[in-house]
Amino acid sequence: LTCLGGFASPGPVPPSTALRELIEELVNITQNQKAPLCNGSMVWSINLTAGMYCAALESLINVSGCSAIEKTQRMLSGFCPHKVSAGQFSSLHVRDTKIEVAQFVKDLLLHLKKLFREGQFN
C-alpha cells in the first residue's frame, strides 16, 4: 500500500482518493485479522467488472453482526448509494460460488489495487 502514497499530491483531491481510502480499509481488515474474519461467514462471489462496488456491497451486506466489515460496507455505499435495479444486480453475482468473507476481502483488495495502479478510479 505504501506505493499508493506516490499518487497523492497537493491541490485538488484526485479521484483516486476514495478508492485509496477503501483500499486502506481493506488492508486494515486483512492485517488485523486474528480469528476467522466474521466467524468464517460465507458470501457470494462476484464479477470483478463493471458494477462491482454495488455487487460487493450486496454480497457483504448479507454478513450480519460483524463490526470488522461495517466501515467497508458503508464506504462501498459511497460508490453505490441508491439501489440498482433487480435486472442490473442479477448479472453482478456469480450465484453458484460462495467464499469466505476473508477470501472475498482479499480478492476485492487485489482487484482494487490493480485498478488503482491502472488509474481506473471510477
Epitope: T17, E21, I61, Q73, M75, S77, G78, K83
Partner: antibody, heavy 118, light 111 residues
Amino acid sequence: EVKLVESGGGLVKPGGSLKLSCAASGFTFISYAMSWVRQTPEKRLEWVASISSGGNTYYPDSVKGRFTISRDNARNILYLQMSSLRSEDTAMYYCARLDGYYFGFAYWGQGTLVAVSA
Amino acid sequence: DIVLTQSPASLAVSLGQRATISCKASESVDNYGKSLMHWYQQKPGQSPKLLIYRASNLESGIPARFSGSGSRTDFTLTINPVEADDVATYYCQQSNEDPWTFGGGTKLEIK
C-alpha cells in the same frame, strides 16, 4: 466528530435561484455519498438529492431539472444549486451524510432555511 | 411513490413505560430479504438523528432502549422504557425505491 454546517439559505422570489453550501468535517468526505433533505413548514421530511463519492447524482421528479447537487472534494463542501424556485420549495434544508440505501442518512447538519415568497 | 403511514400521529406515555410507533408502507420495502426501512428521532429545535437502520439494526451510540422490528410493509419502533429525554418526533424512511420517502412523523410526549 462528524460536523455538517449548512449556509446560503434566505428569502427568494418565485422563479429565483439560490445556492446552498454544506461544509463537512470529521470524516473522509470523498469516501461517502452525500444528500440534501428538506423539512417543510408542516414538518414533513422530503429527500431532495444525493451524490455518490464518484459524482453520480440522484433526484426525485419534483426537483429534477431545477436543482443540481455537486461536491468539491478538495474543500469538503457539498452544494445544492436551486433554480426556478416555487413556493412549495420553502423549507429547512438539511445536508446529510448518506451511508447508502442499507444504512440511511447517518449524520445531519443543523439546516438552513429557504423561503420562497413574492 | 411508496407512501409511509405512521400511527399514531402523537402519543403520550408515562416515564418507564413502553412506547410503540407503527409505520406501514404502501408496498414492500424489502430487498433480497433485507428491509430498507430506517427510523429517525428529531428533538424540538434540532435536526433528525438516525436511530435504527434496516428495520432492526441499532445505530452506533443509540441506547438499547430503542428497538425496531418488522418486514415488507409493516414496521414498528419501540422505546422501552421511555425516558424524559425521548420527547421528540419520530420518522420512518424507506430507501428501497426512488424517490426515497418518509413517514409523516409521530410526536412522543410524556404523560
